[in-house]
């Protein structure tokens, strides 16, 4: 049987054979991949990149969250959507997951001017069906998925909006485990609205296999702030394996080449 994909840290600390990022298959060796380093001064301002409109993000829900063996994932099940933000159509929220390390300087997938952050949160959305502008795009959409990426850094205060998620981690240490979070809204996880005005935009891929090149990325400039103990909880409570021998951390794909693509900013 073909080895399953994994992160470098898993291959280093496990006896199970697995495919590290440089050996990922599917579309992962193509040339419009994510994540990337964003050179903030090279990104051109595009006036079309206006504010986002969040629908259902403010509704308190009891979300299901699971350890999927690669990350912790909240199942959003179309209960929220986004529009605006220079996107061509409304997009339905599918899932939210995060990437992290056990150190402050290397947990994010994207970097800004060469600088990585402690974590990165991805809210993954799919374009509402029947909203593509032309036949070619409908058949081969480069923006079928919209990911909102939020960089996370350490602050001095506990971020209360993240507590339901952080507290749920203890219930899902092993892969395939799931639990229900205490009631919360997606808005609780986001920075204040005025901090969502500044963002970067480029076309790329999923950062995990099969690395499909159909993602319109939005990377927000202003990081979310979590307390150090909230950040460390992810690497302390979660494991890649059912034996709980390999702590879940460094679930970060290495940076990919920008190539001929351009990054624009709001």
């Amino acid at each position: 049987a073909e080895s399953h994909w994994c992160y470098e840290v898993q291959a280093e600390s496990s006896n199970y054979p697995c495919l590290v990022p440089v050996k990922w298959g599917g579309n992962c060796q193509k040339d419009r991949q994510s994540p990337i380093n964003i050179v903030t001064t090279k990104a051109k301002v595009d006036k079309k990149l206006g504010r986002f409109f969040f629908s259902g993000y403010d509704k308190k829900q009891t979300w299901t969250v699971q350890n999927n063996g690669h990350s912790v994932m909240m199942l959003l099940e179309n209960k929220a959507s986004i529009s605006g933000g220079g996107l061509p159509a409304p997009y339905q929220a599918k899932q939210l997951h995060l990437h992290w390390s056990d150190l402050p300087y290397k947990g994010s997938e994207h970097s800004l001017d060469g600088e990585h952050f402690a974590m990165e949160m991805h809210i993954v959305h799919e374009k509402e069906k029947g909203t593509s502008r032309n036949v070619k795009e409908a058949q081969d959409p480069e923006d079928e998925i919209a990911v909102l990426a939020f960089l996370v850094e350490a602050g001095t205060q506990v971020n209360e909006g993240f507590q339901p998620l952080v507290e749920a981690l203890s219930n899902i240490p092993k892969p395939e485990m799931s639990t229900t979070m205490a009631e919360s809204s997606l808005l609780d996880l986001l920075p204040k609205e005025e901090k969502l005005r500044h963002y970067f935009r480029y076309l790329g891929s999923l950062t995990t296999p099969t690395c499909d090149e159909k993602v319109v990325w939005t990377v927000f400039r202003e990081p979310i702030q979590l307390h150090r103990e909230q950040i460390l909880a992810f690497s302390q409570k979660l494991y890649y394996d059912k034996e709980q021998t390999v702590s879940m951390k460094d679930n970060v794909r290495p940076l990919q080449q920008l190539g001929q693509r351009t990054v624009i900013k709001s």
């Epitope: 150190l103 402050p104 300087y105 350490a154 950040i231 460390l232």
Partner: antibody, heavy 119, light 107 residues
């Protein structure tokens, strides 16, 4: 009371290796990162690297990644730094410090270990 | 990496005087600057965090200000025990970097 107690002064020969220690007390050792800093005589402070004692994860200043190896022993609440292929440039005082915030200030420091490399 | 410039290299003051130390970052770092005191043959001691936040146990004569690229540590009435080297450290970007220090001397 939070305390970091470092091992004593060392005189070593060029080309050899040495390992210094930093014993922590007065707080939960695995909840805070331990940083290592170099200070040459009459000079300023230079960051070497950091270890997460809970996980063993490390990160190094590029300048020191082939020079220093950081480890930690949870059972004794002790962090270690090994320095290899020693030269006179490595003669310095080495401090361990606790990172008070994640990726920020250093709120408690050890008393320093003086390393002299001489033949 | 972010460069930190401290000035002056040496400050000479008389006891009771007010003194200010300057620290400049090569790019904007918000308020992510921290100040340390290092007495002769001692280890650094945290005086001020995040540009202006006080530390418990540190005398109230020490204060800090500034944001962006320019920061100041002040001692409003110098005492003989304040004779030391003062360092600033930026924690905005990895790797963290320190200034070269300012030495405080008594006239």
């Amino acid at each position: 009371d939070v305390q970091l107690v470092e091992s004593g002064a060392e005189l070593v020969r060029p080309g050899t290796s040495m390992k210094m220690s930093c014993k922590a007390s007065g707080y939960a050792f695995t909840n805070y990162l331990i940083e290592w800093i170099k200070q040459r005589p009459g000079q300023g402070l230079e960051w070497i690297g950091v270890i997460n004692p809970g996980s063993g994860g490390t990160h190094y200043n590029e300048k020191f990644k082939d020079k220093a190896t950081l480890t930690a022993d949870k059972s004794s609440s002790t962090a270690y730094m090994q320095l290899s292929s020693l030269t006179s440039d490595d003669s310095a005082v080495y401090f361990c410090a606790r990172e008070g915030d994640y990726g920020a200030r250093f709120d408690y420091w050890g008393q320093g270990t003086t390393l002299t490399v001489s033949s | 990496q972010i460069q930190i410039t401290q000035s002056p290299a040496i400050l000479s003051v008389s006891p009771g005087e007010r003194v200010s130390f300057s620290c400049r970052a090569s790019q904007s770092i918000g308020t992510r600057i921290h100040w340390y005191q290092q007495r002769t043959n001692g280890s650094p001691r945290l005086l001020i965090k995040y540009a202006s936040e006080s530390i418990s146990g540190i005398p109230s004569r020490f204060s800090g200000s500034g944001s962006g690229t320019d920061f100041t540590l002040s001692i409003n009435s110098v005492e003989s025990e304040d004779i030391a080297v003062y360092y600033c450290q930026q924690s905005n970007s990895w790797p963290t970097t320190f200034g070269a220090g300012t030495k405080l001397e008594l006239k």
